[in-house]
C-alpha cells in the first residue's frame, strides 16, 4: 500500500513483497526489502524506528537507496504495520504483517502489564479496547468484571477487528473495573492484557469560594481561601488562581479531592490558597477557576487588606430616628472596621440586653416601640485587637397618635338634666401634641338606633353627617373653650372643653384630634332627660373600704318602676371610630341590683348602698324610670370611680442645709396616698412644736423657721401617716455663726 502521492520527481518506495497484508507463521524469518530514489528509513510495530535488538535494517549490497528489514524468529507481537519512507517526507509504502502465533493471539505492548480505557457513560458512545490480533479471523469476546460479564460480537454495535481491537458501546462496560479480550483456538482460551476502565465525566456544577465575601485582614495576618468545585462523578479537575500579587513569596496552593459520600452523585474538589503574612499589595480580587477540560467555572471574592486594626462609624449612621407607637424600630449599626467590632448598646447610660421586646447587636431592634423607649441610645464599638472605642448617639423619638383619655372610662350614654349647663371634655394625649382638636355634633334622632337600621352591634349609629359646632342651628347653644395644657399622670395633655349653655336637645358630640402621625376621636352621647336624677352620698369619690350610696330621685307623679342596674362586668366595647351603644336599648345586657325605695311628698328615691366599696364596684350604674303615661323608659347613667387605697409616699427629698443664724429656712414635704396622709414634723425625734419662729402651713406640708437660732440645729423629720402606714424623710440643718447675747437684766 502507498501513503502520500508521488511527486513529479519522486516515486513511492517499492517493497519486495507487493501486497497490503502478509500472513506468516511464528518463529519464521520476516525479510522485506525497500528500494527508492533517495535516503530511506523503516518503521515497525512496538518500536517506531527505534533500536529494537531483534530487528536488523541493512543496506542492500546491490544498490544505492535500498534497505532490507530482517526479523528472525518472529513472534505474535511483531504483528502490525511495516512502513518504508523517504526521510523528511510523507511518501511511504506500508505492508501489514500478521505473525500467526496460536499460543499468543493478542499483541501486547512490550511495556504494558495493563492498559487503560477511558469511557463516558454516554449511551451513544462506543469505546475501542485495543486488543489487536496476530491472527485476522479470530473468535474474540470481551470479558468485563466484576460481576463477570461476557460480550460477543453481534455484527452491529459490538465487533472485533484485528487491526483496531474490540468495539463496544461504552455504557455496557461502565459498571466494570476492568476488561480483557479472550480468543478461543481449538478449545483453548487466550487472554489479552487487562484494561482498567476509567469512566470520564466533565460537568462542573458549581465553584464556591469560602469565605464567599467580605474577606478582611490586616497586614501580617494569614489569608486562607478555600475553593470547592462540585462535579459529577468521574471528573478530573485542574484548579487555577488569579490574585493581585502574583510574585508572592509565602503563597501556598494545596489541591485535593474530598471524600465522596457513598450513594452521592457528586464529587468535591478543594483548592486552598494560603498567604502567610499578607501585605497591602495582596488586596484585590481573588479568582479561582476549576476546569475539567470540557467545562470551566470560576468564582471571585474581594480581599481587603488594612494597614492596621481600626474602627469607625459609617457615614450612613443615623442620629435621629422617628417612630410611631407600636411600630418595629430597626437602628442598624453602620461601621467600617477590621476586625468586626464588639457592639454594645446603652440607653440613657444603662447597658441594653436582648429580651423578648428588644434585640441588640448589629441592629438594635425594638419589637413594638412604646413611649418609654424614647431617649438617647448610645452604641459603642470596640476593636477587639486594638481596643479602640468609638461611640455614637442615636435619639429615638416615639410619636403617639392622639389618644383621648376619657375614651377608656366613658359611659355608653350619659344623661343630662334638661336645661342645665354642661361641660364636655376631651383630654388628648399625643406626641407631638395635636395641631388641632375639632368638635362636631349631630341630633340624636338623626342617628336612630333601630335594629333594622343598625350598622353593627358595636356601632349602632348609622350617622355620617357630622356638623361643625359653629353651626348649632337646631341644636344646643355651644361655646368651645380655648385648649388648655395640663400635666396629668406625669404627661403633658391637651384639654379641649365644649360648654353647652342649656341642655335642650339630645345630640351626639364628637371631638377629633389630629397630629402628624394619626387621629383620634371620641363620641359623646349627650342624652337630655327630664327624667330621674342621680346623686352620690357623700358626693366625693369613695376610696376602697368606704361606704357610698347612689340615689336615684324621680318625680313620682311622672315616673314609676324605678330600678337600678349595673353595666358589666365590662362596659360595652367602644372601638376606635365607633359610637357607644345607647343603654335603654340594651337593658338585657345589664345586671339588676337590689335597692331600697323611699318616698317624700314629691319624689320617689331609690337608694343603692355600697358598704365597704371595692375596686370591683366601680363602673356605670343605670337608673331606669318608666313614664306613667307613655310607658317609655328613661335611663340615666352615672359613672362611679372607686379610688384605690395607696400607702403614704413622700415625693422629693429633704436636703441637708447649712444656714446662718438669723436667716430663714423654708422646706416643703409633699405627700400622696389614699386616704390622704397626715403630715407631722419632728426635730431630733421629738414632735416639732409651733412657736413664734416655727410655722407649719398647708396641712403641715410647708415648714418655715424664721430668725434661726443655734438651738434650731438638728435632725428634722417629715412623716406622713395614714391607716395604711407611714413614710418619712430626714434632713440635718446646720446653723452657723455666733449667737448674739440679749441682755434683758
Amino acid at each position: 500500500a502507498s501513503v502520500g502521492l508521488p511527486s513529479v520527481s519522486l516515486d513511492l518506495p517499492r517493497l519486495s513483497i507487493q501486497k497490503d497484508i502478509l500472513t506468516i507463521k511464528a518463529n519464521t524469518t520476516l525479510q522485506i526489502t525497500c528500494r527508492g530514489q533517495r535516503d530511506l528509513d523503516w518503521l515497525w510495530p512496538n518500536n517506531q524506528s527505534g533500536s529494537e535488538q531483534r530487528v536488523e535494517v541493512t543496506e542492500c549490497s546491490d544498490g544505492l537507496f535500498c534497505k532490507t528489514l530482517t526479523i528472525p524468529k518472529v513472534i505474535g507481537n511483531d504483528t502490525g504495520a511495516y512502513k518504508c519512507f523517504y526521510r523528511e517526507t510523507d511518501l511511504a509504502s506500508v505492508i501489514y504483517v500478521y505473525v500467526q502465533d496460536y499460543r499468543s493471539p493478542f499483541i501486547a505492548s512490550v511495556s504494558d502489564q495493563h492498559g487503560v480505557v477511558y469511557i463516558t457513560e454516554n449511551k451513544n458512545k462506543t469505546v475501542v479496547i485495543p486488543c489487536l490480533g496476530s491472527i485476522s479471523n479470530l473468535n474474540v469476546s470481551l470479558c468485563a468484571r466484576y460481576p463477570e460479564k461476557r460480550f460477543v460480537p453481534d455484527g452491529n454495535r459490538i465487533s472485533w477487528d484485528s487491526k483496531k481491537g474490540f468495539t463496544i458501546p461504552s455504557y455496557m462496560i461502565s459498571y466494570a473495573g476492568m476488561v480483557f479480550c479472550e480468543a478461543k483456538i481449538n478449545d483453548e482460551s487466550y487472554q489479552s492484557i487487562m484494561y482498567i476502565v476509567v469512566v470520564v465525566g466533565y460537568r462542573i456544577y458549581d465553584v464556591v469560594l469560602s469565605p464567599s465575601h467580605g474577606v478582611e485582614l490586616s497586614v501580617g495576618e494569614k489569608l486562607v481561601l478555600n475553593c470547592t468545585a462540585r462535579t459529577e462523578l468521574n471528573v478530573g479537575i485542574d484548579f487555577n488562581w488569579e490574585y493581585p500579587s502574583s510574585k508572592h513569596q509565602h503563597k501556598k496552593l494545596v489541591n485535593r479531592d474530598l471524600k465522596t459520600q457513598s450513594g452521592s452523585e457528586m464529587k468535591k474538589f478543594l483548592s486552598t490558597l494560603t498567604i502567610d503574612g499578607v501585605t497591602r499589595s495582596d488586596q484585590g480580587l481573588y479568582t479561582c477557576a476549576a476546569s475539567s477540560g470540557l467545562m470551566t467555572k470560576k468564582n471571585s471574592t474581594f480581599v481587603r487588606v488594612h494597614e492596621k486594626p481600626f474602627v469607625a462609624f459609617g457615614s450612613g449612621m443615623e442620629s435621629l430616628v422617628e417612630a410611631t407607637v407600636g411600630e418595629r424600630v430597626r437602628i442598624p449599626v453602620k461601621y467600617l472596621g477590621y476586625p468586626p467590632p464588639e457592639i454594645k448598646w446603652y440607653k440613657n447610660g444603662i447597658p441594653l440586653e436582648s429580651n423578648h421586646t428588644v434585640k441588640v447587636g448589629h441592629v438594635l431592634t425594638i419589637m413594638e416601640v412604646s413611649e418609654r423607649d424614647t431617649g438617647n441610645y448610645t452604641v459603642i464599638l470596640t476593636n477587639p485587637i486594638s481596643k479602640e472605642k468609638q461611640s455614637h448617639v442615636v435619639s429615638l423619638v416615639v410619636y403617639v397618635p392622639p389618644q383621648i383619655g376619657e375614651k377608656s372610662l366613658i359611659s355608653p350614654v350619659d344623661s343630662y338634666q334638661y336645661g342645665t349647663t354642661q361641660t364636655l371634655t376631651c383630654t388628648v394625649y399625643a406626641i407631638p401634641p395635636p395641631h388641632h382638636i375639632h368638635w362636631y355634633w349631630q341630633l340624636e334622632e338623626e342617628c336612630p338606633n333601630e335594629p333594622s337600621q343598625a350598622v353593627s352591634v358595636t356601632n349602632p349609629y348609622p350617622c355620617e353627617e357630622w356638623r361643625s359646632v359653629e353651626d348649632f342651628q337646631g341644636g344646643n347653644k355651644i361655646e368651645v373653650n380655648k385648649n388648655q395644657f395640663a400635666l396629668i399622670e406625669g404627661k403633658n395633655k391637651t384639654v379641649s372643653t365644649l360648654v353647652i349653655q342649656a341642655a335642650n336637645v339630645s345630640a351626639l358630640y364628637k371631638c377629633e384630634a389630629v397630629n402628624k402621625v394619626g387621629r383620634g376621636e371620641r363620641v359623646i352621647s349627650f342624652h337630655v332627660t327630664r327624667g330621674p336624677e342621680i346623686t352620690l352620698q357623700p358626693d366625693l369619690q369613695p376610696t376602697e373600704q368606704e361606704s357610698v350610696s347612689l340615689w336615684c330621685t324621680a318625680d313620682k307623679s311622672t315616673f314609676e318602676n324605678l330600678t337600678w342596674y349595673k353595666l358589666g362586668p365590662q362596659p360595652l366595647p367602644v372601638h376606635v371610630g365607633e359610637l357607644p351603644t345607647p343603654v335603654c336599648k340594651n337593658l338585657d345586657t345589664l345586671w339588676k341590683l337590689n335597692a331600697t325605695i323611699f318616698s317624700n311628698s314629691t319624689n320617689d328615691i331609690l337608694i343603692m348602698e355600697l358598704k365597704n366599696a371595692s375596686l370591683q364596684d366601680q363602673g356605670d350604674y343605670v337608673c331606669v324610670a318608666q313614664d306613667r303615661k307613655t310607658k317609655k323608659r328613661h335611663c340615666v347613667v352615672r359613672q362611679l370611680t372607686v379610688l384605690e387605697r395607696v400607702a403614704p409616699m413622700i415625693t422629693g427629698n429633704l436636703e441637708n442645709q447649712t444656714t446662718s443664724i438669723g436667716e430663714t429656712i423654708e422646706v416643703s414635704c409633699t405627700a400622696s396616698g389614699n386616704p390622704p396622709p397626715q403630715i407631722m414634723w419632728f426635730k431630733d425625734n421629738e414632735t416639732l412644736v409651733e412657736d413664734s419662729g416655727i410655722v407649719l402651713k398647708d396641712g403641715n406640708r410647708n415648714l418655715t423657721i424664721r430668725r434661726v437660732r443655734k438651738e434650731d440645729e438638728g435632725l428634722y423629720t417629715c412623716q406622713a401617716c395614714s391607716v395604711l402606714g407611714c413614710a418619712k424623710v430626714e434632713a440635718f440643718f446646720i446653723i452657723e455663726g455666733a449667737q448674739e447675747k440679749t441682755n434683758l437684766e
Partner: antibody, heavy 117, light 112 residues
C-alpha cells in the same frame, strides 16, 4: 479587549503533520478552558478538542483521537493543536475558542488547513 | 452522539418582521440539574461564530433583546424580532448535555 489569533494553517499532503497555534490576549488565559472547533467547506461546525486550564485534561472528537494533540503554554498565552496523519476530511477552517461554563464565548478568526495531494 | 437537526434555510423574512429558527435534538437536552444545555450562535458573513444564547434562553453579554430562545427538551426555537440587516448570517445551535458537544448544520437567515 479579548483577542484570539490563530496561525499555522497550510496546504498539507495526506499523512502529513502540522501544528496550529492560537495567541490569546485581553484576558487571563490560564483561567479559561480552550477548545479547537473546525468549520468544514460545507459550513458545518465540528468540535475538535478541548483542554483544561492547567493542561492536565484533554478531550478529542472521535474523528481525530490518536492523531491530534491539544496543548497549551500558559506562560506564553498560547494554545496549540498538533495534527498528525492528516486526512483530506481534516480540510477545514480551524477556530480556537475560549470556554467558560462550557460555552464558547469568544472565537478567533480562524486559520485554514487544506489536506490535498 | 447527540444529533442536532436544523433546516437549511429560514422562512424568507422582510426587515422589521419577526422570524423563528428551529432546532431539534435526538435526545433531551434537559439535564438533571434542571437546566437545558442548548446554545445558539450566529455567524455573520466573513466572521467567526458569536454566542447569542446559552442554557436555551439566557442571552449572552452584549446581545440585543431582540433575540430570545425557548423550547422543550428536544425542540428549540430562536426568535428574532424586528429583523435588521446585521442579523443576516448562519444560525447554529449546539448541545452541551453530552460529550462530544455537537452542532446543528446551521440555518441561513433568508431575506425576501
Amino acid at each position: 479587549e479579548v483577542q484570539l489569533v490563530e496561525s499555522g494553517g497550510d496546504l498539507v499532503k495526506p499523512g502529513g503533520s502540522l501544528k496550529l497555534s492560537c495567541a490569546a490576549s485581553g484576558f487571563t488565559f490560564s483561567m479559561y478552558g480552550m477548545s479547537w472547533v473546525r468549520q468544514t467547506p460545507d459550513k458545518r461546525l465540528e468540535w475538535v478538542a478541548s483542554i483544561s486550564i492547567g493542561g492536565s485534561y484533554t478531550y478529542y472528537a472521535d474523528s481525530v483521537e490518536g492523531r491530534f494533540t491539544i496543548s497549551r503554554e500558559n506562560a506564553k498565552n498560547t494554545l496549540f493543536l498538533q495534527m498528525n496523519s492528516l486526512k483530506s476530511e481534516d480540510t477545514a477552517l480551524y477556530y480556537c475558542a475560549r470556554e467558560m461554563d462550557g460555552n464558547y464565548d469568544y472565537w478567533g478568526h480562524g486559520t485554514t488547513l487544506t489536506v490535498s495531494s | 452522539d447527540v444529533m442536532i437537526t436544523q433546516d437549511e434555510l429560514s422562512n424568507p423574512v422582510t426587515f422589521g418582521e419577526s422570524v423563528s429558527i428551529s432546532c431539534r435534538s435526538s435526545k433531551s437536552l434537559l439535564y438533571k440539574d434542571g437546566k437545558t444545555y442548548l446554545n445558539w450562535f450566529l455567524q455573520r458573513p466573513g466572521q467567526s461564530p458569536q454566542l447569542l444564547i446559552y442554557l436555551m434562553s439566557t442571552r449572552a453579554s452584549g446581545v440585543s433583546d431582540r433575540f430570545s430562545g425557548s423550547g422543550s427538551g428536544t425542540d428549540f426555537t430562536l426568535e428574532i424580532s424586528r429583523v435588521k440587516a446585521e442579523d443576516v448570517g448562519i444560525y447554529y445551535c449546539q448541545q452541551l448535555v453530552e460529550y462530544p458537544f455537537t452542532f446543528g448544520s446551521g440555518t441561513k437567515l433568508e431575506i425576501k
